[in-house]
C-alpha cells in the first residue's frame, strides 16, 4: 500500500505564438482545479481501462479576475498535493490523465458551470520510494508543469511497496533468512505473516495466513505434539486404541521445494537439493537475471543484475507469484462496498454500484435527495439508496408532476358521490349518512354517530374533505 502524490507547479500559456486568452475576466471571475486519473501499465489497453489505480480531485484554487488588456499569466493554483492512495502493489509503470478545470463564478442558475481547459496524458515508469520526478506537458496553447512520486505507507517498502519492514530487534543483525531493508538499514525485512496463533517454534508458512507444521507437531496451529511412544512406526497409524495422534503431513509431503528441487527429511525439518541456477531454503531464489526476462504477464523485473543477486518480479494488478505467473481473483477480496457488483476485467477491477452509491469502490453514499426536486409542493423523502416524493394533496407520480384524481380511490362511503375540488375532494352523501367521507350514519331521531355536527352543516350536506 502507498500513496501517489502529484504537485502542480504552474498552469499557463505555453511558449510560442498563439498565447491563449485568459480563462477568467472581470465579468466572469473563475478559479482552477485539477483532477488526476491513474491506470496501471504501459500497454495500449490501459487507455481503455477506467482509473483502476485511483483518482483524485484537487481543492479549488484562489478566485482569479483577469486585468483588462493583460496577457494570460500563470494562473493561481490550489494549495497542496493531489494524493491518490493505492492499496495493492505499485505497478512500476503507469498511465496518467490530468484534467485542468475552470469553475466560473458568475450568476449561473444551478451553480457555477465547469469547463475543461486542458487534458494531458502520458505513460511513465516510476519506482516507489524514489525522488520527485518533474514533467512538462502541453495541451493546445496551455502548458502544465508538475512533479510526482509514489511513496509506500509503513510498514511497506521497496520499489513496489510489497516488502514489509519492521524495526530491528537486535542492534547488529537481522534474524535468520531476513535481509536489511534498504534504504532503511536500521530495519529488517519482515517475515511472512502466518496464520494468527501459528506456533513460531513448530510451524512455518510459505503463503500469508497458512500454518504448516514441522515434523512431530500437528493441529491447525502446530501446537499439538505427535505421540510416538506406543505407535507401530515413527510416523505411526491413526488409532484410538494405541492412543496415537494423527501426525501432520510429513515435512516433504507436497514437496515444499520449488523450481524442481528435491526434498529430503532431516531430524528437525527438511532439506532441499536445488537444481543448478536456484538456491534458498526452498529453492525459491534463482540465479536467473532480469536479462533472462523471468517475469510473466507484464511483471517488472528489479535487481538480479548478476546470477548471485536475486531478482524480484513486481506484478501488475491481477497477477501474483514469484514470477507473476498466477492470476489473482481480485473479486474474492470483495473490494466493492455497499453491495456493489465486482467485475474483474483482467486489466482492471470495476465496481458496478447499487443505486445511491458511487465511487471506484462504491464507497460514497450519495445524498438521495440532493438536487432532487419534487414538484407542486411535494417533499423529498430519503430511503434505501433511492428517493421518493411525498406529494401534496391533489398530486401524484414520482416527482409529483401528475395531477391526481382524488376521486379515483372511491373515497365516499355508503354510496356518496365524489366531486373533485381544487383543495381536495367533496363527498355528497346519500340520505342517512354524513361526515367528510359519508362514514357516519344519521340516527332516526336526527342525532348522528358524530359527537357533534360541525356548525352550519346539516346531515346530507356535501362535506368537503380537507
Amino acid at each position: 500500500a502507498g500513496v501517489f502524490e502529484l504537485q502542480i507547479h504552474s498552469f499557463g500559456p505555453g511558449p510560442g505564438p498563439g498565447a491563449p486568452r485568459s480563462p477568467c475576466s472581470a465579468r466572469l471571475p473563475c478559479r482552477l482545479f485539477f483532477r488526476v486519473c491513474l491506470k496501471p501499465g504501459l500497454s495500449e489497453e490501459a487507455a481503455e481501462s477506467p482509473c483502476a489505480l485511483g483518482a483524485a480531485l484537487s481543492a479549488r484554487g484562489p478566485v482569479y479576475t483577469e486585468q483588462p488588456g493583460a496577457p494570460a499569466p500563470d494562473l493561481p493554483l490550489p494549495d497542496g498535493l493531489l494524493q491518490v492512495p493505492f492499496r495493492d502493489a505499485w505497478p512500476g509503470t503507469f498511465s496518467f490523465i490530468i484534467e485542468t478545470w475552470r469553475e466560473e463564478l458568475g450568476d449561473q442558475i444551478g451553480g457555477p458551470a465547469w469547463s475543461l481547459l486542458a487534458r494531458v496524458a502520458g505513460r511513465r515508469r516510476l519506482a516507489a520510494g524514489g525522488p520527485w520526478a518533474r514533467d512538462i506537458q502541453r495541451a493546445g496553447a496551455w502548458e502544465l508543469r508538475f512533479s510526482y512520486r509514489a511513496r509506500c505507507e509503513p510498514p511497506a517498502v521497496g520499489t513496489a511497496c510489497t516488502r514489509l519492514c519492521r524495526p530491528r530487534s537486535a542492534p547488529s543483525r537481522c534474524g535468520p533468512g531476513l535481509r536489511p531493508c534498504a534504504p532503511l538499514e536500521d530495519e529488517c525485512e519482515a517475515p511472512l505473516v502466518c496464520r494468527a496463533g501459528c506456533s513460531p517454534e513448530h510451524g512455518f508458512c510459505e503463503q500469508p495466513g497458512e500454518c504448516r507444521c514441522l515434523e512431530g507437531w500437528t493441529g491447525p496451529l502446530c501446537t499439538v505434539p505427535v505421540s510416538t511412544s506406543s505407535c507401530l512406526s515413527p510416523r505411526g497409524p491413526s488409532s484410538a486404541t494405541t492412543g496415537c495422534l494423527v501426525p501432520g503431513p510429513g515435512p516433504c509431503d507436497g514437496n515444499p521445494c520449488a523450481n524442481g528441487g528435491s526434498c529430503s527429511e532431516t531430524p528437525r525439518s527438511f532439506e532441499c537439493t536445488c537444481p543448478r541456477g536456484f538456491y534458498g531454503l526452498r529453492c525459491e531464489v534463482s540465479g536467473v537475471t532480469c536479462a533472462d526476462g523471468p517475469c510473466f504477464n507484464g511483471g517488472l523485473c528489479v535487481g538480479g543484475a548478476d546470477p548471485d543477486s536475486a531478482y524480484i518480479c513486481h506484478c501488475p494488478p491481477g497477477f501474483q507469484g514469484s514470477n507473476c505467473e498466477k492470476r489473482v481473483d481480485r473479486c474474492s477480496l470483495q473490494p466493492c462496498r455497499n453491495g456493489g457488483l465486482c467485475l474483474d476485467l483482467g486489466h482492471a477491477l470495476r465496481c458496478r454500484c447499487r443505486a445511491g452509491f458511487a465511487g471506484p469502490r462504491c464507497e460514497h453514499d450519495l445524498d438521495d435527495c440532493a438536487g432532487r426536486a419534487c414538484a407542486n409542493g411535494g417533499t423529498c423523502v430519503e430511503g434505501g439508496g433511492a428517493h421518493r416524493c411525498s406529494c401534496a394533496l391533489g398530486f401524484g407520480g414520482r416527482d409529483c408532476r401528475e395531477r391526481a384524481d382524488p376521486c379515483a380511490a372511491r373515497p365516499c362511503a355508503h354510496g356518496g358521490r365524489c366531486y373533485a375540488h381544487f383543495s381536495g375532494l367533496v363527498c355528497a352523501c346519500a340520505p342517512g349518512y354524513m361526515g367528510a367521507r359519508c362514514e357516519f350514519p344519521v340516527h332516526p331521531d336526527g342525532a348522528s354517530a358524530l359527537p357533534a355536527a360541525p356548525p352550519g352543516l346539516r346531515p346530507g350536506d356535501p362535506q368537503r374533505y380537507l
Epitope: F33, C37, P50, L57, I97, G111, C353, L366
Partner: nanobody, 127 residues
Framework: QVQLVESGGGLVQAGGSLRLSCAAS????????MVWFRQAPGQEREFVGG????????AYADSVKGRFTFSRDNAKNTGYLQMSSLRPDDTAVYYC????????????????????WGHGTQVTVSS
Amino acid sequence: QVQLVESGGGLVQAGGSLRLSCAASGRTTSRYSMVWFRQAPGQEREFVGGNSAHDGRSAYADSVKGRFTFSRDNAKNTGYLQMSSLRPDDTAVYYCAADTNPPYGPPWSTPSEYEYWGHGTQVTVSS
C-alpha cells in the same frame, strides 16, 4: 443495464442550430453523469460536455463554451445538447455516454470512464 439512443442529428448550414437528444432506458439515470463526446473522421473521441452525476451541473469543453448548452429532464430520462453558432469543424458523430462515476466534481472527460454508450448521431455543418 442502461440503453442510450441519440437523435436530432442532421445537415445544417454554418451559423445554424441543432438540438440533440439522448433518451435513456432500462434504469433511472438521474444519478448518472450524462455527457456528450464527438468523433470526427480519423480523430480520437473528444469530450464535448454534459451534466454531472452529483448535482446535475453543466461541464463544457472550452472549445464549445458559449455556443453549446447541456440540460437534462430526469422525469423523461433524457439529456439534451443544444448547439448554436455551428461551425464546419463541429462536423462529427456525436455520442451520448452515461456512468455513475465520479461521485463529485465534473464528469470525466475520458471515454474509458463511461460504461454506457449510444450508437451516435451524425452532425454535418456545411459552409
